[in-house]
């Protein structure tokens, strides 16, 4: 995805000294935390696959790109990156695959330049509603985040809290309207069964939305109308059966949109007629000639673009008196 990358050619590994436990203590100019690699030229710090259990306290103030991937952080507390002086340059933070199961309110506070955040591949059983907004005010200070990567953050079923995972994630996205400037949101591979209806309306700046490899069956209650800047919508590898007229019209009305619909088990019956008509006319669907019917059996493997209304029938529903057991 959009992980922060580095052109760092020379990294200085830290000398094995004791990291200061006092985050308020100003770091030395060229200091590099134990178990990390640093490149001041590339403004990059990499603490990768080191089984760290907490965020290093002595991060250099110059850091712009911070990789903390492949660790064992477990919990990200409030102010996990708050330092004196603050990490004012930190723009890209990658925490993927670090066994985080809890991100607390205000975890990313005091990072005024943070534009890219990747929390992918962490089993987030407890994501605070105020993880990104920092406060429980009804309207928070705007977050600087432009890209938020949350792919595969669903915990195993036995570790989930007794609540909707979709609801928990959406609460964090919407709290305090802090993410109004978000342009890229990736939520792939999270077993989402539905998309709460209010989520997209409150993220008006979105350019790229990735919902691929979830279990979305329908978009009936999802509105794309406000997303006038949306450029790519990834819906591949879901459980979509058909897109209805309202959704089709909204997508067609978005001026820059490209939609990706591969690998959905389309049901080619009478309810598919509008979508087929739309597909034949629209230019917004990428690889539209790859879309094929999965059901019913007599229609299996047929290319949607080659269907006509005569092909699309529904078996009549028999009145109860005529039904056989």
């Amino acid at each position: 995805s959009s992980s922060p990358t580095s052109s760092a050619s020379s990294f200085s590994s830290s000398a094995p000294f004791l990291a200061s436990a006092v985050s308020a203590q100003p770091p030395l100019p060229d200091q590099c935390p134990a178990l990390c690699e640093c490149s001041e030229a590339a403004r990059t710090v990499k603490c990768v696959n080191r089984n760290l259990t907490e965020v290093p306290t002595d991060l250099p103030a110059y850091v712009r790109n911070l990789f903390l991937t492949g660790n064992q952080l477990a919990v990200l507390p409030a102010g996990a990156f708050a330092r004196r002086p603050p990490l004012a340059e930190l723009a890209a933070l990658n925490l993927s695959g670090s066994r985080l199961d809890e991100v607390r309110a205000g975890a990313f506070e005091h990072l005024p330049s943070l534009r890219q955040l990747d929390l992918s591949h962490n089993p987030l059983a407890d994501l605070s509603p105020f993880a990104f907004s920092g406060s429980n005010a009804s309207v928070s200070a705007p977050s600087p985040l432009v890209e938020l990567i949350l792919n595969h953050i669903v915990p195993p079923e036995d570790e989930r809290q007794n609540r909707s995972f979709e609801g928990m994630v959406v609460a964090a996205l919407l709290a305090g309207r802090a993410l109004q400037g978000l342009r890229r949101l990736e939520l792939a591979s999270n077993h989402f069964l539905y998309l709460p209806r209010d989520v997209l309306a409150q993220l008006p700046s979105l350019r790229h939305l990735d919902l691929s490899n979830n279990s979305l069956v329908s978009l009936t209650y999802v509105s794309f109308r406000n997303l006038t800047h949306l450029e790519s919508l990834h819906l591949e590898d879901n459980a979509l059966k058909v897109l209805h007229n309202g959704t089709l019209a909204e997508l067609q009305g978005l001026p820059h949109i490209r939609v990706f619909l591969d690998n959905n088990p389309w049901v080619c019956d009478c309810h598919m007629a509008d979508m087929v008509t739309w597909l034949k006319e629209t230019e917004v669907v990428q690889g539209k000639d790859r879309l094929t019917c999965a059901y019913p059996e007599k229609m299996r493997n047929r290319v949607l673009l080659e269907l006509n209304s005569a092909d699309l029938d529904c078996d009549p529903i028999l009145p109860p008196s005529l039904q056989t057991s």
Partner: antibody, heavy 116, light 107 residues
């Protein structure tokens, strides 16, 4: 009953090219993608690529991009696969198969022998 | 790209015996298909969408699984079941991937 007819055998020399055919009948040819699959003796199945007969769009397995070229003739409901610069490793059975999610009908296969 | 690994590569069973073969995916997939190929013939789609039998396939065959682990089971082996069985990834976009096959012989 859907049928995909393929010639039984082709014998060609190394370095030459060959064009294998697959004639479809008893279904609407343009409504389904056509796939090609390779099987070497005593080996497994290897997907080569597919073609949409309606518009000629193709997809290829990276491994076969410089080896296979897929085309169709809609008027005769026939799919073709040209294999170029043949080597002994290209000796195999080549199947055409109708498909989308899966391959629901297969041809009988053409046994290609590359021999000097 | 998802890799499919079938096991065992070769197995034998006596008539009437229960047979189970597996197909393991390198990452989670939604469904799996199975093909039967008898010696000297082309493959036939046998089971699709993990558990649905193609028309004409005997009811002694069944398929199951989810995520990365799938299996094909024959409740009572018959001589005509001797064949090679291939699993294939559920997808409608390239590439289409097959497992290496399980060769089932009659004992």
């Amino acid at each position: 009953q859907v049928q995909l007819q393929q010639p039984g055998t082709e014998l060609v020399k190394p370095g030459a090219s060959v064009k294998l055919s697959c004639k479809a009948s008893d279904y609407t040819f343009t409504s389904y993608w056509m796939h090609w699959v390779k099987q070497r003796p005593e080996q497994g199945l290897e997907w080569i690529g597919n073609i949409n007969p309606s518009n000629g769009n193709t997809n290829y397995n990276e491994k076969f991009k410089n080896k296979a070229t897929l085309t169709v003739d809609k008027s005769s409901s026939t799919a073709y696969m040209q294999l170029s610069s043949l080597t002994f490793e290209d000796s195999a059975v080549y199947y055409c198969a109708r498909g989308g999610w899966d391959f629901d009908y297969w041809g009988q296969g053409t046994t290609l022998t590359v021999s000097s | 790209q998802v890799v499919l690994t079938q096991s065992p590569a070769i197995m034998s069973a006596s008539p009437g015996e229960k047979v189970t073969m597996t197909c393991s995916a390198s990452s989670s997939v939604r469904y799996m298909h199975w093909y039967q190929q008898r010696s000297g013939t082309s493959p036939k789609r046998w089971i699709y969408d993990t558990s649905k039998l193609t028309s004409g396939v005997p009811a002694r065959f069944s398929g199951s699984g989810s995520g990365t682990s799938y299996s094909l089971t024959i409740s009572s082996m018959e001589a005509e079941d001797a064949a090679t069985y291939y699993c294939q990834l559920w997808t409608s976009k390239p590439p289409w991937t097959f497992g290496g096959g399980t060769k089932l012989e009659i004992r």
